[in-house]
């Protein structure tokens, strides 16, 4: 096609995970899939400076057709910010990843004590639950609501009924996953909420309760509801 176009990202989902916490000796791959016309070129920076092969033992691989940078057997000195710069004569775009190389003994995720905290709000109000997670390896985080089916919290197998409200795994590391927002709260939103964090060693979770109170001035309306009439 003759339509000239500045560089653009073709698969932002593959770029959502900005923070990569990787055990020493593992392989790291950063991708910046892009398009443009003419086809853009890609170069990599480490901590804002040109990234050269001699900057690390064993060098690195660039797979231009996959828009990727690959570093094998990472070591602590590989920690830092890696920026892909994709450019053609019509423009330039860039994206930065942060690499942390983990040498500690990996442990199951640790959740900050007291979080999430119990909360209460009135009908129509907003509430947020916060969960702070510390994990050597990238954790996968879920927010879970304990729900009822046919008036029961537990199934015939004795297991609780659960609904995953929000989840993040390999493609997401945004801090927003650590906060669960509930807008325009209803009575049905009351109950137990669980923040679950897992990694390759195990799973940890903390729970909190949401109490929903009638909105001020609505008591009459609630009392007059047909559900309460004989």
């Amino acid at each position: 096609s003759n339509n000239k176009r500045a560089p653009y990202w073709t698969n932002t989902e593959k770029m959502e995970k900005r923070l990569h916490a990787v055990p020493a000796a593992n392989t790291v791959k950063f991708r910046c899939p892009a398009g443009g016309n003419p086809m853009p070129t890609m170069r990599w920076l480490k901590n804002g400076k040109e990234f050269k092969q001699e900057h690390r033992i064993g060098g690195y691989k660039v797979r231009n057709q996959h828009w990727s940078l690959i570093m094998e057997s990472v070591v602590p000195s590989d920690k830092g910010n890696y920026t892909c710069v994709v450019e053609n004569e019509y423009g330039s775009i860039n994206h930065t990843y942060h690499l942390d190389v983990v040498e500690r003994s990996p442990h199951r995720p640790i959740l900050q004590a007291g979080l999430p905290a119990n909360a209460s709000t009135v009908v129509g109000g907003d509430v947020e639950f916060v969960c702070k997670v510390y994990s050597d390896a990238q954790p996968h985080i879920q927010w879970i609501k304990h729900v009822e089916k046919n008036g029961s919290k537990y199934g015939p197998d004795g297991l609780p009924y659960l609904k995953v409200l929000k989840a993040a795994g390999v493609n997401t590391t945004d801090k927003e996953i650590e906060v669960l927002y509930i807008r325009n709260v209803t009575f049905e939103d009351a109950g137990e909420y669980t923040c679950l964090a897992g990694n390759s060693i195990g799973i940890s979770f903390h729970s909190a309760w949401l109490t929903v109170l009638p909105a001020p001035g609505r008591e009459k309306e609630i009392t007059a509801s047909p559900d309460y009439l004989e």
Epitope: A137, Q138, G198, N199, S200, G202
Partner: antibody, heavy 124, light 112 residues
Amino acid sequence: EVQLLESGGGVVQPGRSLRLSCAASGFTFSSYAMHWVRQAPGKGLEWVAVISYDGSNKYYADSVKGRFTISRDNSKNTLSLQMNSLRVEDTAIYYCVRGAGRGYTYGPDGFDIWGQGTMVTVSS
Amino acid sequence: DIVMTQTPLSLSVTPGQPASISCTSSRSLLHSDGKTYVYWYLQKSGQPPQLLIYELSNRFSGVPDRFSGSGSRTDFTLKISRVEAEDVGVYYCMQYIEAPLTFGGGTKVEIK
């Protein structure tokens, strides 16, 4: 039925290589971390390695670091252990063990399901 | 690494009598989520280990209620209230809080 079946064991000379496999069935393999644990003849249990559910994280015991590589193929429900530069002290039964899942667990979060094991003998 | 020390090395028990195995960890296994990550296994001759107790005191499904786990932080105990012939084998404790996961040296239980 949840099952793990190891294969690939055998007799090998010191310095040579061997690749173990573990076929998983009866559960969603791609949602679980997986481990290798070994047991030398007449001895206790020794943890060898773990791989996360998606293969992005791997950890090894110091005794095998740099020689063994754990990997997985979620499309084939298979866990592998590539063992290079084998030593006499690597002689053991190697067990494949299911680790933690990705979601809420009502019960143990892993180390509940073990394979029958495959024997590796390193001898000259 | 967390060291798991198990005692005794072996135990000879009369059927119907109680038995107790101790395990000590070099660091606390009490996690921030309030759980204590010690597991107990029984390995019968020629078989892989089978899970008995998880998270200190929870019996795994299908495990008879004569098995119980207790303890806190660094000191743990597995009790068999009335030993039966099928309980013979080697018992192991394991810490499941950090890698490398580590096991106790094992306690061999036999019937008198």
